[in-house]
Every structure is written in structure tokens, then in C-alpha cells.
Interface confidence: medium
């Protein structure tokens, strides 16, 4: 008898090369094989559970950056007046959550912020829990 | 044929709002659906393997905090004279281990330390390994 | 009917007690039960996917240390002029990758660097993806 295979784990890596003041970071998923999707510049959460979250990037100017998942809830990450980020976190997310950036720059500039090595990774840690597809 | 489902992953999120000097932090599990259990203010390990461990909190006064898993072994985390913690680690734990806090304050105060956003998450990384239920 | 079991997750913990200037760190796997293998002082990657990577150690002298996975690609970790490391990261690795150290010391010494608590852990986060055994 063939041993059971794992169904694919919900995970995604998105890249971002620019962010906009009072808006967010423009995210793109370089792979078509991701098991999670990007919609309206947000990562859509279909499965309840803990997620491992990795966030990296070097910014062209100082900014404050937050990563949100639900209106009215505190951010997953919040960094004030930084020019780079290299953080890992764990958070409980649920169906209907959407993971998205908010960015504020401290110059009066209208320009978008350029990002080197901008990468956000989400990996579901509780396969077997509730998912809505 | 229905594809095989994942059995639930061993994981738990506990919260703590206060810690006691020369003792530990009082942990509670807000969810009844956790796959791991709290007993005698410790998280009980039933499954061998690597665990992803996330520890967060803001303390009302400076303290030294350690997170232990086995008598006679070094701590999983050890923080000296801090007022906050936001750490992630990976450790190998095994059946019969118990994860618990030890706290020391540096004031002569007898009072409890209040904790804002106190959270400890453990997520098993090796399903398929040995478990004793 | 017996519920399906998880096949073992690809993971390994290697230890290193010394590193060599302009070379790497001598890694050994203390357990025979690891699901990943060490070959020519490198950890062999058989399965595509995200990996959780934990790197720890205290060094006997200041060094610059990088952890590589593929020729011509940037490092997984790069630390300049440090005497210790305690880092966690997430990276996408693929079949044929090999994870190995590169070390440079800043003394003129030819002697090995001694390492206390030197530990590198890799844990595959995408079971169900492609593996070549």
C-alpha cells in the first residue's frame, strides 16, 4: 500500500520592490505554484491556524511599516523609522483575514520607496485545521 | 477517493498577564481546541521533535526570565534584566518534557509583575514522529 | 480505519565545535535518526520548499560567517565580525542544494576557531512538495 502523501501546505512567498507613502507595498508572487493567493495587494487567508511569517527588505528611505491582518486588530509587525527589516514572527490567522502592508514615510516626498530584497513569506503551521476554499 | 487529511498538529498558544518573583508566569490557554495541554502551570510535551517557540510580552518592571523544559537542562530562552521580550526559537523537545517559566525581579518588591501581551506559542515541527497520548 | 500517519518531515540538527579560517565549520549530526544527511561537510537538500533555519553558536574569536546553499547565490545568513550568533530564518531551498558554512577570521592566526553551543537546525516546511531520494 502506498503511504499517504501530504496535501500541499498553505504557503506563499511574495516580493515587493516598492512601497508608497500612506499606502502599502506593491506585492507580487513570482511563482504560479503558490498554494495561497494575492488579491487587491493582500495575501488571502483561507485556513485557520498559526502561521510562520518572515519579512525582509532594505528601503530607499526611512519609513514606518506595519503588517496588518484584520481591521481593528493590532499589526503582526510594526517597525518605526527603519531603513531595513529582517524579522520572523508567529501569529494565529483565520479564514477571511487578509495580510497587507501600511507604510508611512517621514519626508514630505511623494515618491514611492524603492525596496531591495523585499520578501514576505507566510507558511501555515496547522494543516488539518479548518480551511475554506 | 478522498485525499488523506492531516491529523491535527500539536500546537498551543498560552497567555500570561502576571508573573511572580522567584516563581513563574501564570499561564492560561484561551482556547479549548488546543492540541496541547497546560498542567501545573507548565505546557506538557507529548510528541518528540523540533518545536517552533514564540515568546512575547511587556513587563511592568525589569525582570530576568527563563523558559525551561527539563530539570538539569539549560533554558530554551534566557533574558536578563529586560522589560520586554519578542523572541523566536527552535528546540528539540521530547515526551515527558514540561515547558515552564522562571522569573526573578531585581526590586525588593513582593508584588506580582504585570504583563501586557504576554504570549507563548509552541508548534510541533515533526508530525509523524513519536507521540505518547 | 486507522487515520493516516504523517510521513517523517525532512529535518536535521547538526552541531559544530570548530571552524577553520577561509574554510567552514566542521558539522556532525549527533543523531542517527535524522531524515536529512550530511555529506562533505554540507547538509544535502532533497526536497523543494521553504525551510526553517536556526543557527546558534559562541565563537572563541571574532569572525565573519556565512551560510550558503548554492554556488552563485547569496548567503542564507551573513554575519560580519561577530563572536556569537543566534538567528532564525526562512528560505526556499531545492533538490541539489547543499547548505554549508564559509568562515573568515580577522586575525592573522592559522588556528581553528572553537565554538560553544554551535548548532544548525533545518526543518522542511512544505511536505507534499517535490522530493528526490
Amino acid at each position: 500500500q502506498v503511504p499517504p502523501q501530504y496535501p500541499p501546505i498553505q504557503s506563499i512567498r511574495v516580493q515587493f520592490t516598492r512601497c508608497e507613502n500612506e499606502k502599502g507595498c506593491i506585492i507580487t508572487s513570482p511563482s504560479k505554484d503558490e498554494t495561497m493567493k494575492v488579491q487587491d495587494n493582500s495575501i488571502i487567508i483561507n485556513c485557520d491556524g498559526f502561521y510562520l511569517i518572515s519579512l525582509k527588505g532594505y528601503f530607499s528611505e526611512e519609513l514606518s511599516l506595519s503588517l496588518y491582518y484584520r481591521k481593528g486588530r493590532g499589526p503582526l509587525f510594526s517597525l518605526s523609522k527603519v531603513t531595513s527589516v529582517d524579522s520572523i514572527g508567529v501569529a494565529y490567522l483565520a479564514f477571511k483575514d487578509k495580510v497587507y502592508f501600511n507604510v508611512t514615510t517621514h519626508s514630505t516626498s511623494y515618491k514611492d520607496i524603492q525596496v531591495n530584497g523585499g520578501e514576505l513569506i507566510l507558511i501555515h503551521q496547522n494543516p488539518g485545521g479548518f480551511c475554506a476554499y | 477517493q478522498v485525499p488523506p487529511q492531516y491529523p491535527p498538529i500539536q500546537s498551543i498558544r498560552v497567555q500570561f498577564t502576571r508573573c511572580e518573583n522567584e516563581k513563574g508566569c501564570i499561564i492560561t490557554s484561551p482556547s479549548k481546541d488546543e492540541t496541547m495541554k497546560v498542567q501545573d502551570n507548565s505546557i506538557i510535551i507529548n510528541c518528540d521533535g523540533f518545536y517552533l517557540i514564540s515568546l512575547k510580552g511587556y513587563f511592568s518592571e525589569e525582570l530576568s526570565l527563563s523558559l525551561y523544559y527539563r530539570k538539569g537542562r539549560g533554558p530554551l530562552f534566557s533574558l536578563s534584566k529586560v522589560t520586554s521580550v519578542d523572541s523566536i526559537g527552535v528546540a528539540y523537545l521530547a515526551f515527558k518534557d514540561k515547558v515552564y517559566f522562571n522569573v526573578t525581579t531585581h526590586s525588593t518588591s513582593y508584588k506580582d509583575i504585570q504583563v501586557n501581551g504576554g504570549e507563548l506559542i509552541l508548534i510541533h515541527q515533526n508530525p509523524g514522529g513519536f507521540c505518547a497520548y | 480505519q486507522v487515520p493516516p500517519q504523517y510521513p517523517p518531515i525532512q529535518s536535521i540538527r547538526v552541531q559544530f565545535t570548530r571552524c577553520e579560517n577561509e574554510k567552514g565549520c566542521i558539522i556532525t549530526s549527533p543523531s542517527k535518526d535524522e531524515t536529512m544527511k550530511v555529506q562533505d561537510n554540507s547538509i544535502i537538500i532533497n526536497c523543494d520548499g521553504f525551510y526553517l533555519i536556526s543557527l546558534k553558536g559562541y565563537f572563541s574569536e571574532e569572525l565573519s560567517l556565512s551560510l550558503y546553499y548554492r554556488k552563485g547565490r547569496g548567503p542564507l545568513f551573513s554575519l560580519s565580525k561577530v563572536t556569537s550568533v543566534d538567528s532564525i530564518g526562512v528560505a526556499y531551498l531545492a533538490f541539489k542544494d547543499k547548505v554549508y558554512f564559509n568562515v573568515t577570521t580577522h586575525s592573522t592566526s592559522y588556528k581553528d576557531i572553537q565554538v560553544n553551543g554551535g548548532e544548525l537546525i533545518l526543518i522542511h516546511q512544505n511536505p507534499g512538495g517535490f522530493c528526490a531520494y
Partner: antibody, heavy 115, light 112 residues
Framework: EVQLVESGGDLVKPGGSLRLSCVAS????????MSWVRQAPEKGLQLVAG????????YYTDAVKGRFTISRDNAKNTVYLQMNSLRAEDTAIYYC????????WGQGTLVTVSS | HIVMTQTPLSLSVSPGEPASISCKAS???????????LYWFRQKPGQSPQRLIY???NRDPGVPDRFSGSGSGTDFTLRISRVEADDAGVYYC?????????FGQGTKLEIK
């Protein structure tokens, strides 16, 4: 293919007003900041004004502050430059450019301020 | 404001010959983490400007590999390895590290 088409340039008397428009196509307009750059006769290039993708943040060169207003309508893929209290020294070709690093330019529209 | 100074202001080159334009910034264009915001533009006679090079040395799509950018800190160079008749025009450098974006005064390239 990215295209930027400016319009609205004209001959106007000092103290007069003009509204320049730039219609964009070939890219997701609402995701990018936009700029206006001018070139006086036989002169170099000067950034005049810029606006972020949401329209919530703007930049003006000192010489036009309080007189010019940059705005955008993302539904119409259009960026505007409202120019009031025009002076002779505002005479130039006005170019619309994509982003603050000007990776694409329009063909320009000529503004002449003269009595 | 950062001042960008180009040299020479004009040059005349025969087809097939190399050409080089220098651009000097009044302060370093290097950001703390390594990006340098130096750009090159070309304006052909009667046309709008076109960006050729971004971040010192990266060619924009469609720009021939005859064009190359180099430099660091405050000193930068645009090189054309083999000039062609179509390369005639005014070349501008520009910096984007600090508001406002400022351009050099331009270098007029004439083909003999």
C-alpha cells in the same frame, strides 16, 4: 505599451491660468506616482510637481508653490497640473512622466506666458 | 538641493568611435544600504527625454548594450562604446536620493 499623452498647453497672458492633463495607458496607473517636468526654451530639465499613487502626497518645486496644483483621477487614468498666476518664466514645454524616476515620458505640451 | 555638474557640455564624435560623459554630484548619492540613485536620460532633437540608465549602471529595456553607466559616490560616467548617427542629442544625468530630483545641465552629443 506605456503611453502618456499631455494636453492643455496654450498661449496665456501673465497672471492667467491653464490646466494641463496627462492621460496614461499601458500600465496600472493607480499604482504609480506621477510627475510633471518642464523644459524652458534652450534650457535643461526641472521637476515641477509630483503626486503619489493615492493622490494623498504631493511635491512642488519652490518656484511654483502656492500657484500650481497637481492632482489625479485614478478612475480616468489622468494626472492634472492646474497652473494659476502664470509668469513669463513659466514658459516651457511641460512633460508628464511616470513615477519620480521618470521611466516613461509624454511628448510634452507647450505653455507660453506672454503679454 | 544637490547640484549635478556634467562635463563636457558638448562633444563631437565620429560614428564607430567611443564617447564618454562625466557627471559629478555635490554630495554622495550612495544610500546607507548600498543603492545609488543616479540616472541618465537622452533627449533627441525635437523629442521628449528618454531614460537610458537607472541606478548607475542598469540599462532600461530596449537600450542597446553600447550604453553603459559606471561610478560611485559623487562621480559617474556614461559611456557609448561605438557611437551611431541615431545617438545624437542632449544627455542628462539626474539624482534621486534627495528631494527634489535634480538634473545636470546637459551634454550635447554631435555626430561628425
Amino acid at each position: 505599451e506605456v503611453q502618456l499623452v499631455e494636453s492643455g498647453g496654450d498661449l496665456v497672458k501673465p497672471g492667467g491660468s491653464l490646466r494641463l492633463s496627462c492621460v496614461a495607458s499601458g500600465f496600472i496607473f493607480s499604482s504609480y506616482s506621477m510627475s510633471w517636468v518642464r523644459q524652458a526654451p534652450e534650457k535643461g530639465l526641472q521637476l515641477v510637481a509630483g503626486i503619489n499613487s493615492a493622490g494623498s502626497s504631493t511635491y512642488y518645486t519652490d518656484a511654483v508653490k502656492g500657484r500650481f496644483t497637481i492632482s489625479r483621477d485614478n478612475a480616468k487614468n489622468t494626472v492634472y497640473l492646474q497652473m494659476n498666476s502664470l509668469r513669463a518664466e513659466d514658459t516651457a514645454i511641460y512633460y508628464c512622466a511616470k513615477r519620480w524616476v521618470f521611466d516613461f515620458w509624454g511628448q510634452g505640451t507647450l505653455v507660453t506666458v506672454s503679454s | 538641493h544637490i547640484v549635478m555638474t556634467q562635463t563636457p557640455l558638448s562633444l563631437s564624435v565620429s560614428p564607430g568611435e567611443p564617447a564618454s560623459i562625466s557627471c559629478k554630484a555635490s554630495q554622495s548619492l550612495l544610500l546607507s544600504y548600498g543603492n545609488t540613485y543616479l540616472y541618465w536620460f537622452r533627449q533627441k532633437p525635437g523629442q521628449s527625454p528618454q531614460r537610458l540608465i537607472y541606478k548607475v549602471s542598469n540599462r532600461d529595456p530596449g537600450v542597446p548594450d553600447r550604453f553603459s553607466g559606471s561610478g560611485s559616490g559623487t562621480d559617474f560616467t556614461l559611456r557609448i562604446s561605438r557611437v551611431e548617427a541615431d545617438d545624437a542629442g542632449v544627455y542628462y544625468c539626474g539624482q534621486g536620493i534627495q528631494d527634489p530630483f535634480t538634473f545636470g545641465q546637459g551634454t550635447k552629443l554631435e555626430i561628425k
